[in-house]
Structure formats: structure tokens, C-alpha cells
């Protein structure tokens, strides 16, 4: 297979792509032009990075959830004292229930007042937002395009300043030499066009229909 790819690199016109229906074949076909000069990140490496990023994201989410739980616990411990029942009997517990019910009623009143204020604020915000739209005139939001993000950028976004300290991904990657010829670059470009044409539902549809 490697020999075939080197022959193809020497010929002026690349051979037409064979009709393949299995995704594993597509993968093999996609890697063929790079048998000699490997892509910057291999598929397995990409998968490894994705897995790593997902793990980091998962850890971050778990840490945040843990922090929230801790915060809730701290808030509750300051608001709710532990029940001290030693030496207290039926009479005191009955009275304690009365005291706690009174406290609950008070908190409920406060919550109701706060909710009323929040509702009022939300209404005011909605009114002001509407006024802003009216003043600006109607406008259309630009359609958002998908942006390709490098592994480094993704790590930077996830970890912020810690990205460089925790993992220097580039250290794990093979450096690509810059001695590529124009011809090779052009062929690589053609190959990429082929893959782009095949990617997406339309490309797959054409491939399967042929």
C-alpha cells in the first residue's frame, strides 16, 4: 500500500478514487496520500486528544459540582443549626417545633417578598429590552459559522492559564519538516478537496449512489 502511494505521488495525475462503501476503507483512503509525509495530527492522536479534553472537561464539571455541593453545605450549616436534643423532653420539642414553624413562616414571607421583587425586576428588564429594540430598529443576528479550533486553543479555553503548566501538547507531537515542495502541497490540497467533497451528507450520498 505504501509503494502504491509513492508511485501515485510521482505520477502527474492521481488515479481516480476506487468506489468504497465501508467507513474503514474511507479512512484508509484518506491516509493514503500521506503515507510518506504524515499529517500534523494522526486520527488516533486526534481521538486521544479529544478523549483527553473530554476527561478534563468532565473533571472540571465534577469539581464545579463538588464546589457547589460544598457551598450548599456551608450555607445550610450557617442557616440550620444541628438539633440539640440531649436533655430536652416532649415539652421542649413541642415548643421547638413551634419556634421552627415560626422561623419557616418568616423565611417564607421573606422568600415571597424577594420573589415579588425578582418578578418586578424581570418585567422591568423585559420592558427596557423591548425599548432598546424599538430604538435600534429591527436587526437580524448574524448566522454563526462553525470555527475550527486547534487542540491548543481548546486546551487554553478549557484550562485557561493552567494549560501550559499542566500539558504541553506540542511536546507529544512529531514536528513536520517545512521542506514540502509546491507540487506536493498542491497534491495535498487536491486530496483535501476530494475529502471535503466526500465529507458531509451530500458527499456520502454521492459516494453511496455511485
Amino acid at each position: 500500500m505504501a509503494d502504491g502511494s509513492s508511485d501515485a505521488a510521482r505520477e502527474p495525475r492521481p488515479a481516480p478514487a476506487p468506489i468504497r462503501r465501508r467507513s474503514s476503507n474511507y479512512r484508509a483512503y484518506a491516509t493514503e496520500p500521506h503515507a510518506k509525509k504524515k499529517s500534523k495530527i494522526s486520527a488516533s492522536r486526534k481521538l486521544q486528544l479529544k478523549t483527553l479534553l473530554l476527561q478534563i472537561a468532565k473533571q472540571e464539571l465534577e469539581r464545579e459540582a463538588e464546589e457547589r455541593r460544598g457551598e450548599k453545605g456551608r450555607a445550610l450549616s450557617t442557616r440550620c443549626q444541628p438539633l440539640e436534643l440531649a436533655g430536652l423532653g416532649f415539652a421542649e420539642l413541642q415548643d421547638l417545633c413551634r419556634q421552627l414553624h415560626a422561623r419557616v413562616d418568616k423565611v417564607d414571607e421573606e422568600r415571597y417578598d424577594i420573589e415579588a421583587k425578582v418578578t418586578k425586576n424581570i418585567t422591568e428588564i423585559a420592558d427596557l429590552t423591548q425599548k432598546i429594540f424599538d430604538l435600534r430598529g429591527k436587526f437580524k443576528r448574524p448566522t454563526l459559522r462553525r470555527v475550527r479550533i486547534s487542540a491548543d486553543a481548546m486546551m487554553q479555553a478549557l484550562l485557561g492559564a493552567r494549560a501550559k503548566e499542566s500539558l504541553d501538547l506540542r511536546a507529544h507531537l512529531k514536528q513536520v519538516k517545512k521542506e514540502d515542495t509546491e507540487k506536493e502541497n498542491r497534491e495535498v490540497g487536491d486530496w483535501r478537496k476530494n475529502i471535503d467533497a466526500l465529507s458531509g451528507m451530500e458527499g456520502r450520498k454521492k459516494k453511496f449512489e455511485s
Epitope: 440539640e84 436534643l85 436533655g87 423532653g89 416532649f90 415539652a91 421542649e92 413541642q94
Partner: antibody, heavy 121, light 107 residues
Framework: EVQMVESGGGLLKPGGSLKLSCAAS????????MSWVRQTPEKRLEWVAT????????YYPDSVKGRFTISRDNAKNTLYLQMLSLRSEDTAMYYC??????????????WGQGSSVTVSS | DIQMTQTSSSLSASLGDRVTISCRAS??????LNWYQQKPDGTIKLLIY???RIHSGVSSRFSGSGSGTDYSLTISNLEQEDIATYFC????????TFDTGTKLELK
């Protein structure tokens, strides 16, 4: 031996304030609720206040609510009763007592010797 | 508030007698009743709790009984050291209340 010693009593005028103390010993103080009970000159016993073991909850009869405050210092094994706006009817012997309970029935199982408070103009 | 009342404020008895002191609550207190003894020097001791349970260190000559609203303290074979004032106290509802006491005297 379980022991309670009250102090801080005295003679004062109506409207005055006073703070009684009760030093407890012979038991794990922080494990028990505590109470103050007074005995009037007519020898009637009146419950005045109760505080939970950790000091979070306190209980009072209407006659002293808002004027008296029970508190405790578990590090010092000491119980306190802060009395404000004293009236002549507050004249009594004030006893400090340890609380315990059995199947919901609470009782004062050990009492101090008492501290005398006289409110008179 | 629950009112506690004793049938008599004082009682005379002879040494060796069996003495019964009664106490009534103004409403049901479901056995949440305690008995205290106050000696002439002012010291107060718990005798009986939860109607019939004898407190540690208290002589078995003391016993308690009752239910609902009516309760009693019995001293069998009265001794000199039993000469004191006896109080009942309900532990059912706050405020905790005592009766006026029954003073036990020798005949």
C-alpha cells in the same frame, strides 16, 4: 459528683439588671440541657428558662420572655441568666439545674444551692 | 398553661407511717410527671421522674404512680430524713409548671 454553684445574686431596684452565673462540675456539661428555676418568697417553684446542650435553643415562660436571657459557655462549664428590667415579682431564690429526659419526659435531676435576688425600691 | 394542684398544702404523719401525696393536672399530661423533695435547708432533689421511675440514689421507700391527670407519691415507712416539702412538676407542655408543694410534718 455532679455539682452546680450559683453566684451573682443581690439586692437591686426595680428596672435594674443582673447577671447570674452557675459553675457546673462532675459531668460532661456540653452534653446536657440546663435550666433556671426560681422559688418565690411564698415558696412557689417557677421554671424560668431552659437552654439546649449546645446553646442553640432556649425556652422561657411568658412572664420573663424578652427580659431574661439564658446562655452558656461550654468551654467554661458555666450557665448564665441575664436579667433586665427587673420587677419586684422577680424577687426569689434562683436555682440552676441540670436537665435530663426519659422517653420524652424531661426533668431537673441535679440542682444547685441557689442564689438570692431581691428587687425592692 | 397547665395548672398543677395538690390536695393538701401540709400533711402530718408519724415515723414508720405510709404517706401518700396527691397531685392533679388541669389536663392530660401522659405520665410526664416528676416529684422533687426540698429539705428545710433549701436543697432540692429529684425523687421520681416519668410518674414512677426512681432517680438514682433515692431510697426505694419512695414510689410513684398515676396516669392521665391524677398522680401520687407514696413514702412507705416514713423516716426522720423524709421530713421536707414535696413538689410535683409536669413536663408535658411549656411552660413547665410546679404545684404549690406539700409540707410533710411529724405528728
Amino acid at each position: 459528683e455532679v455539682q452546680m454553684v450559683e453566684s451573682g445574686g443581690g439586692l437591686l431596684k426595680p428596672g435594674g439588671s443582673l447577671k447570674l452565673s452557675c459553675a457546673a462540675s462532675g459531668f460532661t456539661y456540653s452534653n446536657y440541657a440546663m435550666s433556671w428555676v426560681r422559688q418565690t418568697p411564698e415558696k412557689r417553684l417557677e421554671w424560668v428558662a431552659t437552654i439546649s446542650s449546645g446553646g442553640s435553643y432556649s425556652y422561657y415562660p411568658d412572664s420573663v420572655k424578652g427580659r431574661f436571657t439564658i446562655s452558656r459557655d461550654n468551654a467554661k462549664n458555666t450557665l448564665y441568666l441575664q436579667m433586665l428590667s427587673l420587677r419586684s415579682e422577680d424577687t426569689a431564690m434562683y436555682y440552676c439545674a441540670r436537665r435530663d429526659n426519659y422517653f420524652g419526659s424531661s426533668f431537673m435531676d441535679y440542682w444547685g444551692q441557689g442564689s438570692s435576688v431581691t428587687v425592692s425600691s | 398553661d397547665i395548672q398543677m394542684t395538690q390536695t393538701s398544702s401540709s400533711l402530718s404523719a408519724s415515723l414508720g407511717d405510709r404517706v401518700t401525696i396527691s397531685c392533679r393536672a388541669s389536663q392530660e399530661i401522659t405520665n410526664y410527671l416528676n416529684w422533687y423533695q426540698q429539705k428545710p435547708d433549701g436543697t432540692i432533689k429529684l425523687l421520681i421522674y416519668y410518674t414512677s421511675r426512681i432517680h438514682s440514689g433515692v431510697s426505694s421507700r419512695f414510689s410513684g404512680s398515676g396516669s392521665g391527670t391524677d398522680y401520687s407519691l407514696t413514702i412507705s415507712n416514713l423516716e426522720q430524713e423524709d421530713i421536707a416539702t414535696y413538689f410535683c412538676q409536669q413536663g408535658h407542655t411549656i411552660p413547665l409548671t410546679f404545684d404549690t408543694g406539700t409540707k410533710l410534718e411529724l405528728k
